[in-house]
Interface confidence: medium
């Protein structure tokens, strides 16, 4: 079904409609500053990232999957892995980096009509099960059938902003991506720190609304560098 | 409107089982993940476990582990709690959650009542 | 464990502001920067006041605002009404597992 491909890589390696940004969302998110990860038996800053905890390959980043970080590891813990490049062994779609798809076993270079047919294909014979399988491999359903007939309401899970209805984009919150409200005027938001730091984060927020952009806010100028706050500002 | 309904709650021995259920509706069930929460006479709010939409994916509070199995069954648009050896310190009023922004509705719960 | 603390109490008079603190750890409060307040009437469910520590969801009045320094958030009520009068309470998560961890409720009393 629908809901059986949405929780695979392969949706998400995808040209627009199906696929675009999808994994963290990059740019349509905002992320929160100082946040911590779990990291053994302490919490980890950003700039000491401990890997991300998982349950789902639509919790990690495009081009990451989720899964034990060990061979035969506690099948509890997993979290989000680099993908696999072309010619490794994988297991699932999911595994492949973008533009590559899990084929017998190894990571395949897609051509990227053929490949969004085949799945256009899977979802349109199997919609309305709970199970099907995509290159041979059976998949859990996840996501509602209705994901891509109606858009998602605030806090309804998503795997791109596109799945979200206008005003929310698509962000990670904590347990998974969720579609959250663009941010207003005074709303507060999140210069990243580096380059690429969105993608680590567990709370996000969305970006600033048309007309807006995220900057320090003007009484906070003189406060330390850590706790400086941005918000969303006319331009 | 978003619409979350329990049931199942009632008096029962310690050490006992009961089912709790929560109806949904009023938007799309399986697209959320979603929680019980309880609150004990006078006392303030526990969480109690949690499920992600797909049912793959479950979390416990530490008291409750071991005893309590959290489920869904998305065709049904339904959410359950399944509790085993009930203990007094179980009495509570127990709240089904969305887990949309936060626990953003809530339904307006049902009494367990573990006592002899 | 995370511990949420909160005053077991605070009162005002209407059309006064009043401020309730939720005092957290680096690894809950502070090091998420997410901290949400319910809002709870004798007898009734809680309901969602504040989310991501400052942001209200839609249909909750002006006069509630959230706002965070250090490990301690905050959840302000300007022009107190009498149907202000109710329980709060903050929560933020705890990593792993997932977990939601409350504060102890706060009792807001309109005089």
């Known amino acids: 079904t629908l809901n059986s491909v949405l929780n695979s890589n392969a949706i998400k390696n995808l040209p627009p409609p199906l696929g675009g940004a999808a994994g963290h969302p990059g740019s349509a998110v905002s992320a929160a500053p100082g946040i911590l990860y779990p990291g053994g038996n302490k919490y980890q800053t950003i700039d000491n990232y401990q890997p991300y905890p998982c349950a789902e390959d639509e919790e990690c980043g495009t081009d990451e999957y989720c899964a034990s970080p060990t061979r035969g590891g506690d099948a509890g813990v997993q979290i989000c892995l680099a993908c696999r490049k072309r010619r490794k062994r994988c297991m699932r779609h999911a595994m492949c980096c973008p533009g590559n798809y899990c084929k017998n076993g190894i990571c395949v270079s897609s051509d990227q009509n053929h490949f969004r047919g085949e799945i256009e294909e899977t979802i349109t014979e199997s919609f309305g099960n709970d199970h099907s399988t995509l290159d041979g491999y059976s998949r859990r359903t996840t996501l509602s059938s209705k994901m891509y007939h109606t858009k998602g309401q605030e806090g309804s899970v998503c795997l791109r902003s596109s799945d979200c209805a206008s005003g929310l984009c698509c962000a990670r919150h904590f347990w998974s991506k969720i579609c959250k409200p663009v941010l207003k005027e005074g709303q507060v938001c999140t210069k990243h720190r580096r380059k690429g730091s969105h993608g680590l984060e567990i709370f996000q927020r969305c970006y600033c609304g048309e007309g807006l952009s995220c900057r320090i806010q003007k009484d906070h100028h003189q406060a330390s560098n850590s706790s400086r706050l941005h918000t969303c500002q006319r331009h | 409107q978003v619409q979350l309904v329990e049931s199942g709650g009632g008096l029962v021995q310690p050490g006992g089982s009961l089912r709790l259920s929560c109806a949904a509706s009023g938007f799309t069930f399986s697209s959320y993940w979603m929680s019980w929460v309880r609150q004990a006479p006078g006392k303030g709010l526990e969480w109690v476990s949690g499920i992600s939409y797909s049912g793959s994916n479950t979390h416990y509070a530490d008291s409750v582990k071991g005893r309590f199995t959290i489920s869904r069954d998305n065709s049904k648009n339904t959410l359950y709690l399944q509790m085993n050896s009930l203990r007094a310190e179980d009495t509570a009023v127990y709240y089904c959650a969305r887990m949309g922004i936060d626990l953003d509705y809530w339904g307006q719960g049902t009494l367990v009542t573990v006592s002899s | 464990d995370i511990a949420l603390t909160q005053p077991a109490s605070v009162s005002g008079s209407p059309g006064q502001s009043i401020t309730i603190s939720c005092t957290g750890t680096s690894s809950d409060v502070g090091g998420f920067n997410y901290v949400s307040w319910y809002q709870q009437h004798p007898g009734k469910a809680p309901k969602l006041m504040i989310h991501?520590?400052?942001n209200r969801p839609s249909g909750v009045s002006n006069r509630f605002s959230g706002s965070k320094s250090g490990n301690t958030a905050s959840l302000t009520i300007s022009g107190l009404q009498a149907e202000d009068e109710a329980d709060y309470y903050c929560q933020s998560w705890d990593v792993s597992p997932i977990t939601a961890v409350f504060g102890g409720g706060t009792k807001l009393t309109v005089l």
């Open positions: 991501d520590g400052s």
